[in-house]
């Protein structure tokens, strides 16, 4: 399993303590070499990956990871039970949901088993390291002749997330973006019927339940409008990857959803 080394920028207040044996300045020992930084991310509070750059070691080394929770009932030192590997060298550890306690200080220790004195300990606030899955089931509906409303779902406690909506037309060289709070809906008050629109959304575990800096991946985009809108700005011909769900299916509301989500709508 090849791991991707992620660089967090969302744990500024985490403290890092390095325990290195003091050595005379004229004798450089392996134990004085700094260990790589461990970077942890909690994916949708389903599992956590703690990874390090194994290639930074002067020679291939299977570093070991231990962890515990500071000042809590879970303060017993635990060994990593599921290592991640990069080119057959340990480069991370995966923890499962039951081992994740978001609101207790997580302590992670990396150690060189050949040089037990060479170890480094870091303390992390896991609630600042949550990355949710991308928003799903994007739907569009017309609120009026010129107003669209975008809705979406998250596979997580919705009130914990904030969102970023981006939209553009086929004439735009850049996205326009709008922050959205936990309500996971967005209205575009003025739609130009001559243009095609694309919307996408991403989410972040902030600010109500944590202070994460990392966003989810972008949702699959959803598109609105097409050529026929040039004849009638409010008669939208839907492209191949879109379907219009009839009013009966949606209790009287006409909504537009992407094909992937349509498949999900009918089969789940």
């Amino acid at each position: 399993l090849n791991t991707t080394i992620l660089t967090p920028n969302g744990n500024e207040d985490a403290t890092t303590d390095f325990f290195l044996t003091s050595m005379p300045t004229d004798s450089l020992s392996v134990s004085t070499l700094p260990l790589p930084e461990v970077q942890c991310f909690v994916f949708n509070v389903e599992y956590m990956n703690c990874t390090w750059n194994s290639s930074s070691e002067p020679q291939p080394t299977n570093l070991t990871l231990h962890y515990w929770y500071k000042n809590s009932d879970n303060d017993k030192v635990q060994k990593c039970s599921h290592y991640l590997f990069s080119e057959e060298i340990t480069s991370g550890c995966q923890l499962q949901k039951k081992e994740i306690h978001l609101y207790q200080t997580f302590v992670v220790q990396l150690q060189d088993p050949r040089e037990p004195r060479r170890q480094a300990t870091q303390m992390l606030k896991l609630q600042n390291l949550v990355i949710p899955w991308a928003p799903e089931n994007l739907t569009l509906r017309k609120l009026s002749e010129s107003q669209l409303e975008l809705n979406w779902n998250n596979r997580f406690l919705n009130h914990c997330l904030e969102h970023l909506v981006q939209y553009r037309t086929d004439w735009d060289h850049s996205w326009t973006e709008q922050s959205v709070d936990y309500r996971h809906k967005f209205s575009l008050p003025s739609v130009d019927g001559q243009k095609r629109y694309t919307f996408r959304v991403r989410s972040r575990f902030n600010p109500l339940c944590g202070s994460a800096q990392h966003w989810s991946e972008w949702s699959h985009p959803i598109h609105w409008g097409s050529n026929s809108s040039k004849e009638n700005p409010f008669l939208f011909a839907l492209e191949a990857e879109q379907k219009l769900i009839s009013e009966e299916d949606l209790g009287g509301e006409q909504k537009l959803i992407s094909e992937e989500d349509l498949h999900h709508h009918h089969h789940h």
Partner: antibody, heavy 116, light 108 residues
Framework: EVQLVESGGGVVRPGGSLRLSCATS????????MSWVRQVPGKGLEWVSS????????DYADSVKGRFTISRDNAKRSLFLQMNSLRAEDTALYHC?????????WGQGTLVTVSS | DIQMTQSPSSLSASVGDRVTITCRAS??????LNWYQQKPGKAPKLLIY???SLQSGVPSRFSGSGSGTDFTLTISSLQPEDFATYYC??????????FGQGTRLEIK
Amino acid sequence: EVQLVESGGGVVRPGGSLRLSCATSGFTFDDYGMSWVRQVPGKGLEWVSSVNRNGGTTDYADSVKGRFTISRDNAKRSLFLQMNSLRAEDTALYHCATGELFFDYWGQGTLVTVSS
Amino acid sequence: DIQMTQSPSSLSASVGDRVTITCRASQSISSYLNWYQQKPGKAPKLLIYAASSLQSGVPSRFSGSGSGTDFTLTISSLQPEDFATYYCQQSYSTPPITFGQGTRLEIK
């Protein structure tokens, strides 16, 4: 007149790093998303990375994800590309361009050569 | 990822000719298609965006058409300065933004 001037290219060994810069003038920098597009001499165009107007949203080609970082300094009207863990296949002429989705104006490019 | 395929890869034409270059997307991209011109040793230049909208300052002999998967760039009357390489690019499903492989237009 719109001007985009790239700098920072050069010869580097595999695994090495370079930081490219793009100095701009002649347009309202804050109004534009910006991108890097590269071209192996004599070959086609390959999109590398884009950043939105305020620097809050970045996108990367899979081939550079985790190794390259795009950033911008709106006060200095500049775009940057930090390239780490460079590989031979990153050898190309790197152009900065205005826009995230399509590219209105382009710089002449700065040449990056990755060779042992 | 969406693949963009241009045809022909190269073509020879004479001044005054009407020239058409085609670009095909591996899936529907609506009208999110853009065309560029690149001359040797120069940076690319945007010609057409949104399939058919002419970029400011581009001569009206250039035009674009198409929607969905099939697009064309037409030069109505070829001028000496039009000999160059032309690229199409989709901005529909991003990232990644993808380009066609290019069409080299040479003097016959």
